[in-house]
Amino acid sequence: LQDPCSKCPAGTFCDNNRNQICSPCPPNSFSSTSGQKACDICRQCEGVFRTKKVCSSTSNAECDCTPGFHCLGAGCSMCEQDCKQGQELTKKGCKDCCFGTFNDQKRGICRPWTNCSLDGKSVLVNGTKERDVVCGPSPADLSPGASSVTPPAPAREPGHSPQ
């Protein structure tokens, strides 16, 4: 025997209080598949969330984050504060990367400059808070009289963090 509710299309629900008549979803609710016994409450995009797509009777609202925040999680379920490049987010707010570390993103944490000497190379371009160092040829490869820039970059061996 066919379930009488299966004929209720998306945007409606099978109303048990009215002899399983297909009733439209009430305001601020939706059903995205047929045969639903109830409509789901629409997601509210509040606070740091803003509406990317409004809720309709057949599909949920979609949110993203207000400017200055970025999405995390499925369907942008979380918003985390942005920082500038060269900074990382702490509980006390955005803090500049410590000397010898950098962050080239608006999110995430600072990480140490590459230690060129571990690969037998020299520093071609100094690192900054926003950019890693650029490693060049090994000092032995440099022509006589040429000098290489060697800032005091922290060790970047696997498993070591800047202290």
Epitope: L72, A74, K91, G108, R111, S161, P162
Partner: antibody
Framework: QVQLVQSGAEVKKPGESLKISCKGS????????ISWVRQMPGKGLEWMGK????????NYSPSFQGQVTISADKSISTAYLQWSSLKASDTAMYYC?????????WGQGTLVTVSS | DIELTQPPSVSVAPGQTARISCSGD??????AHWYQQKPGQAPVVVIY???NRPSGIPERFSGSNSGNTATLTISGTQAEDEADYYC???????????FGGGTKLTVLG
């Protein structure tokens, strides 16, 4: 949509080596940290370490430093966790997760069983 | 590194309030996050950055964090809330993440 898909369950003998994987899709794999988390049978979550796939910078929990190696190949959006010599005490579920503080996406877990 | 201590188990009657504590030296100086894990499943964030609730997580979940204790509160606990709960924090001292030992929440009845 964002997904982290881990390699399948492994059964190994003590002393053997192993490398398990975590493939990311649906986002810019290179620019998000990947962490590895251990859960021994009936026990809690333990953070093992993390990697930034963009440049393969790694950072380990003191408890796991020297015990495992975390690596990544950004060209195939995959992070790895490896052991050179497994012990029976390495028997656990291993999860990869996106992030360093807030872990917003998790792999399904890889069960590693080490038994003679 | 900071150590986070949670009670191994908490029991609550349906409809009552469950509180799970997470204590650690000056944890209030860091963000605390809370994860729910049900048997055979990966953990899921229920509270992030001390008190923020991801969309899709019921309003009965809330969090606070100050001094040496972070707390996860579940008001009007339901049977489906029965799970293991873990607190965690990221510390800028060792650049590491630490999890609490976990708390098994049992909903009685």
């Amino acid at each position: 949509q964002v997904q982290l898909v881990q390699s399948g369950a492994e059964v190994k003998k003590p002393g053997e080596s192993l490398k398990i994987s975590c493939k990311g899709s649906g986002y810019s794999f290179s620019t998000y940290w990947i962490s590895w988390v251990r859960q021994m049978p009936g026990k809690g979550l333990e953070w093992m370490g993390k990697i930034y796939p963009g440049d393969s910078y790694t950072n380990y929990s003191p408890s796991f430093q020297g015990q495992v190696t975390i690596s990544a190949d950004k060209s195939i959006s995959t992070a790895y966790l490896q052991w050179s010599s497994l012990k029976a005490s390495d028997t656990a579920m291993y999860y990869c997760a996106r992030g360093y503080g807030i872990f917003d996406y998790w792999g399904q877990g890889t069960l590693v069983t080490v038994s003679s | 590194d900071i150590e986070l201590t949670q009670p191994p188990s908490v029991s609550v009657a349906p409809g009552q309030t469950a509180r799970i504590s997470c204590s650690g030296d000056n944890i209030g100086d860091q963000y605390a996050h809370w994860y729910q894990q049900k048997p055979g499943q990966a953990p899921v964030v229920v509270i992030y950055q001390d008190k923020n609730r991801p969309s899709g997580i019921p309003e009965r979940f809330s969090g606070s964090n100050s001094g040496n204790t972070a707390t996860l509160t579940i008001s009007g606990t339901q049977a489906e809330d029965e799970a293991d709960y873990y607190c965690s924090t990221y510390t800028f001292v060792g650049f590491t993440t630490v999890f609490g030992g976990g708390t098994k929440l049992t909903v009685l009845g």
